[in-house]
């Protein structure tokens, strides 16, 4: 199961910080970063880094402890750029996170200094059971306002 | 001001477990998280785990997993640390201490110390 | 795990006069938000450690100024500018980068 999350300010749901997906082991979260054609909009390119945080992190919206993981960066606004993230309980990867059913984690972005973006949340929840490939609902949309 | 009051001191036999109280004050207790450090008799400290009140998640230390427990009860704003299987080494004095948030992330206000001794 | 390795082992010093003590750790702390996680604490003969300094460089309040924090990477310093009777105890540097969050091994610090 592939989870598509549009990550972009003009997703009301990111922005309230009421977003969550329910993911089980296997499944991705495919994190898709604004994307534009021509000059973008007036107020500049949204641009940002994604990190995983702890719960007073996800609150305060802040990225600095030492629970606050840098995941990726969403900085090539006018490139089509998506991130995933498998969750999974084992990781072979050193960079990899490790899920635990039942659990949840959190995203936030932080906007860089010269970026338009706002401050963007969401919740993953852990599901129990491992599943087949298969596709989701995507959380917002490339231009939802 | 800010306190953590833990137990008494505690004698068990090997194979046996403990479970060590730390009484939080003068802040909110569901705001911050707990930490637990323990120091053998002459030695250096040593990191155990930690727990965030807030949503009761847990982070131990590989070395004490399977053994370890860290509890809390919002309701007494107390933390509790149980290590079970005691060995001879694992006597020493725990300490519980809280860790402050932005911009610190340090563990800023430690208890008094539980001593443990583990003994036949 | 990381290990956090201080030198020297004890210091004894003129009250009076500077020590330095140093931490070296087997991986930089550089965390990947961009931070580093690298604390000193104090620990006084029959007390609880005591927060000196955290993130490297930052007196935490209370601190007196002669305590200063300093280093990057893997190689950090404690430095004490004028050692005061009341400064002695064991110095623990410690970090948080990293899981498990691991201590130095401790420097004694006595006056001569």
């Known amino acids: 199961l592939r989870h598509v999350v549009y990550w972009n300010s003009s997703n009301p749901r990111l922005l309230r910080g009421d977003a969550v997906v329910e993911l089980g082991l296997n499944d991705y979260l495919d994190i898709v970063c604004p994307h534009y054609e021509g000059p973008g909009p007036p107020e500049g390119p949204e641009t940002f880094a994604l990190y995983m945080v702890d719960w007073p992190g996800y609150e305060s919206c802040q990225a600095e402890g030492p629970r606050a993981y840098k995941r990726w960066v969403c900085s090539l606004p006018f490139g089509h750029v998506q991130f995933s993230e498998k969750i999974q309980r084992f990781t072979p990867f050193s960079l990899g996170f490790e899920f635990l059913p039942g659990e949840t984690y959190y995203y936030i972005s932080v906007p860089t200094p010269e970026s338009s973006g706002q401050c963007l949340r969401l919740q993953v929840s852990v599901c129990c059971k491992e599943r087949k490939s298969e596709s989701a609902h995507p959380v917002g949309s490339p231009g939802e306002s | 001001q800010v306190q953590l009051v833990q137990s008494g001191a505690e004698v068990k036999k090997p194979g046996a477990s403990v479970k060590v109280s730390c009484k939080a004050s003068g802040y909110t207790f569901t705001g911050y998280y707990i930490h637990w450090v323990r120091q053998a008799p002459g030695q250096g400290l040593e990191w155990m785990g930690w727990?965030?009140?807030?949503?009761?998640?847990?982070k131990y230390n590989e070395r004490f997993k399977g053994r370890v427990t860290m509890t809390t009860d919002t309701s007494t704003s107390t933390a509790y640390m149980e290590l079970r299987s005691l060995r001879s080494d694992d006597t020493a004095v725990y300490y519980c201490a809280r860790e402050d948030g932005s911009p610190y992330y340090a563990m800023d206000y430690w208890g008094q110390g539980t001593s443990v001794t583990v003994s036949s | 795990d990381i290990v956090m390795t201080q030198t020297p082992l004890s210091l004894s010093v003129t009250p009076g006069q500077p020590a330095s003590i140093s931490c070296r750790s087997s991986q930089s702390l550089v965390h990947s938000n961009g931070n580093t996680f690298l604390y000193w604490y104090l620990q006084k003969p029959g007390q609880s450690p005591q927060l000196l300094i955290y993130r490297v460089s930052n007196r935490f309040s209370g601190v007196p100024d002669r305590f200063s924090g300093s280093g990057s990477g893997t190689d950090f310093t404690l430095k004490i500018s004028r050692v005061e009777a009341e400064d002695v105890g064991v110095y623990y540097c410690f970090q948080a980068t990293h899981v498990p969050w691991t201590f130095g091994g401790g420097t004694k610090v006595e006056i001569k």
């Open positions: 727990i965030y009140p807030g949503n009761f998640n847990t």
